[in-house]
């Protein structure tokens, strides 16, 4: 329904701790330079200025969309062209232009520092003194380095946030407890916002039709009883819900989000039984917690689908009768049947069927013609399945690091164009593939596997397109989202690539790296063997193992050294020499 | 794990019966479609028949319907194929398979486990 004030509807639905998170969100995702005491000013004003229309809804500018109040806001800050350059011709432009500028300036890989955790006594401190703006500091924090990053999921994480908080404030060793638990929040927290980041560009690049495709397979293989209508209608709410948050309607979504979650505890009966345990928490949980949730059981029998899809000498028929919604039963039908498929593939299975009708229902004889296309389906389903079989195996043999260091071999020779920092975030992040998915019981590896290669490699295309610089990767990031892991599986060796001089300084090394935390360490020697390969792309698994292994032992001998600065000097340029030799 | 062992292959004339059997070890058969397949002499494995979880739905290939029977009894973790009215044709290793989750049922690609196979020879 239409209300008189938008701003005084979102502030009644959502309460003004969630109203006030959602706009620090709003604001540090498209302001990311600015400090919080900026943003947090605004979102006071925000605030007041929400509360006296919810007092009056006839007051002034109160009838105004959000976009207007929010963009009017962001562009009256001063010295806005000096921190932002371009951006500040956003403000030149009326709405919805104005937002759509904004959004197109989202830097997805802003330059900030990495977020440092302060020490755990510090942190309860601060914690303590004023949770609630320990709270707001984490929400910009995340936004600004995550633009796209699901608003009201964050606002979960922030909970979680303040559970542990307030759980290990009070113990004698904090750090030990806080630790573990922080590093899971944030484990989890990373890998929503690639997968975010994923669906926005889905949005973006194939718009809704596509976002919708991938929310029918995912709800059909968690909701496996739900019927068709019933998984239609999630599918549609689920896509306007992330459309508004990666459009930058956060206050919208994030209402809309605890509405679908309203709707589905409300008819638990029609969509699943497993879903009675969120139904009784709280909202935010409630929302996350729904949006986990286990597959349902599978019907006890199931027919195959073969009758109506390809047995059948009307499909064409009823394909041409309504396209949409019979390759939309298509996938739901697949898809409840196998949840042990990753979403990516089953969407290249619906996409193959709907070529081949295409191509079918045009010929002379079409149920001879579709009639083959399950044998088509073959290489689609075993490729998959042999890439988790065969990456898989090759963690549990090489251990996290060892798989990511393959993984970072294999990407640099695939691409040795793109920069450095780039590729060792990717590979790292394609390397905890194994540990996140490889340990799930096998119905489960594919789905985790392929889907979660999918959100990293998109990330890698994010970041690829800010600054092209390698065809082959800009090839397989400008098809098909579904069609992306295949082809960055399939590139080979980039033969068209000359090698990198040679710089002694890459590989000079000083005894800070004795200092550094075991990540960063890791980061380090994962730096050097890709200038390694972007030196000698061609270079055997065995002279890399030995440099890698010579200058472990190197860094290993210099930082257990009495004069550590004097090892580095010494030892370094030996190293350099022996390295280069191993390569010849 | 699921390991499957096929029985009751044999040598028989045309137009006799047999019937053969799938035992199931390491596991419930009950949350798995079943399936057989054969492979002639020289030729590529073909999906002969399957079964639904429950046995509520069966599935024959064309080349044998009306011949052959698929059944399954999930308490003894054992699925069946009755083969009636037996060709030369018919000559091949049958495989038994199972599979948790499946569309198609006639796609072996669906199929996560596999028997050694029992081998049926139709000859006068």
């Known amino acids: 329904e239409a209300h008189k004030s938008e701003i005084a509807h979102r502030f009644k639905d959502l309460g003004e701790q969630h109203f006030k998170g959602l706009v620090l969100i709003a604001f540090s995702q498209y302001l990311q330079k600015c400090p919080y005491e900026e943003h947090i000013k605004l979102v006071q004003e925000v605030t007041d200025f929400a509360k006296t229309c919810v007092a009056d809804e006839n007051a002034e500018n109160c009838d105004k969309s959000i976009h207007t109040l929010f963009g009017d806001k962001l562009c009256a800050i001063p010295k806005l062209r000096d921190n932002y350059g371009e951006l500040a011709d956003c403000c030149a432009k009326q709405e919805p232009e104005r937002n759509e500028c904004f959004l197109q300036h989202k830097d997805d890989n802003p330059n900030l520092p990495p977020f440092q955790r302060p020490e755990a006594e510090a942190m309860c401190t601060s914690f303590q003194e004023n949770p609630t703006s320990f709270l707001g500091h984490y929400l910009h924090e995340v936004a600004r380095r995550h633009p796209y990053f699901y608003a009201p999921e964050l606002l979960y994480y922030a909970e979680k946030y303040n559970e542990v908080l307030t759980q290990c404030c009070t113990e004698s060793d904090k750090a030990a407890c806080l630790t573990p638990k922080l590093d899971a929040v944030k484990e989890k927290a990373l890998v929503a916002a690639v997968r975010q980041r994923m669906k926005c560009s889905s949005m973006q690049r194939f718009g809704e039709r596509a976002f919708k495709a991938w929310a029918v397979a995912r709800m059909s293989q968690r909701f496996p009883n739900a019927e068709f209508a019933e998984i239609t209608k999630l599918a549609t709410d689920l896509t306007k819900i992330n459309k508004e948050c990666c459009h930058g309607d956060l206050l919208e979504c994030a209402d809309d989000r605890a509405e679908l979650a309203k709707y589905m505890c409300e008819n638990q009966a029609t969509i699943s039984s497993k879903l009675q345990a969120c139904c009784d928490k709280p909202v935010l949980q409630k929302s996350q917690c729904l949006a986990e949730i286990e597959h349902d059981n599978i019907p006890a029998d199931l027919p195959s689908i073969a009758a109506d899809f390809v047995e059948d000498k009307e499909v064409c028929k009823n394909y041409a009768e309504a396209k949409d919604v019979f390759l939309g039963t298509f996938l739901y039908e697949y898809s409840r049947r196998h949840p042990d498929y990753s979403v990516s593939l089953l969407l290249r299975l619906a996409k193959k069927y709907e070529a081949t009708l295409e191509k079918c229902c045009a010929e002379g004889d079409p149920p001879a013609c579709y009639g083959t296309v399950l044998a088509e389906f073959q290489p689609l389903v075993e490729e998959p399945k042999n890439l988790v079989k065969t990456n898989c195996e090759l963690y549990e043999k090489l251990g996290e690091y060892g798989f990511q260091n393959a993984i970072l071999v294999r990407y640099t020779q695939k691409a040795p164009q793109v920069s450095t920092p780039t590729l060792v975030e990717a590979a790292r992040n394609l390397g905890r593939v194994g540990t996140k998915c490889c340990t799930l019981p096998e119905a489960q590896r594919l789905p985790c596997v392929e889907d979660y290669l999918s959100a990293i490699l998109n990330r890698l295309c994010v970041l690829h397109e800010k600054t092209p610089v390698s065809e082959k990767v800009t090839k397989c990031c400008s098809g098909s989202l579904v069609e992306r892991r295949p082809c960055f599986s399939a590139l080979t060796v980039d033969e068209t690539y000359v090698p990198k001089e040679f710089k002694a300084e890459t590989f000079t090394f000083h005894s800070d790296i004795c200092t550094l935390p075991d990540k960063e360490k890791q980061i380090k020697k994962q730096t050097a063997l890709a200038e390694l390969v972007k030196h000698k792309p061609k270079a055997t698994e065995d002279q890399l193992k030995t440099v890698m292994g010579d200058f472990a032992q190197f860094v290993d001998k210099c930082c257990k050294a009495a004069d550590k600065d004097n090892c580095f000097a010494t030892e370094g340029p030996n190293l350099v020499a022996r390295s280069k030799e191993a390569l010849a | 794990e699921v390991q499957l062992v096929e029985s009751g292959g044999g040598v028989v004339q045309p137009g006799g019966s047999l019937r053969l059997s799938c035992a199931a070890s390491g596991s419930t058969i009950s949350s798995y479609v079943m399936g057989w397949f054969r492979r002639a002499p020289g030729k590529e494995r073909e999906f002969v028949a399957a079964i639904s979880r429950s046995g509520g739905y069966t599935y024959y290939a064309d080349s044998v319907k009306g011949r052959f029977t698929i059944s399954r009894d999930n308490s003894k973790k054992t699925a069946y194929l009755q083969m009636n009215s037996l060709r030369p044709e018919d000559t091949a290793l049958y495989y038994c398979?199972?599979?948790?989750?499946?569309?198609?049922?006639?796609?072996?690609?669906?199929?996560?486990?596999w028997g050694q196979g029992t081998l049926v020879t139709v000859s006068s």
């Open positions: 398979a199972a599979g948790r989750y499946s569309a198609w049922y006639s796609q072996s690609y669906e199929y996560d486990y």
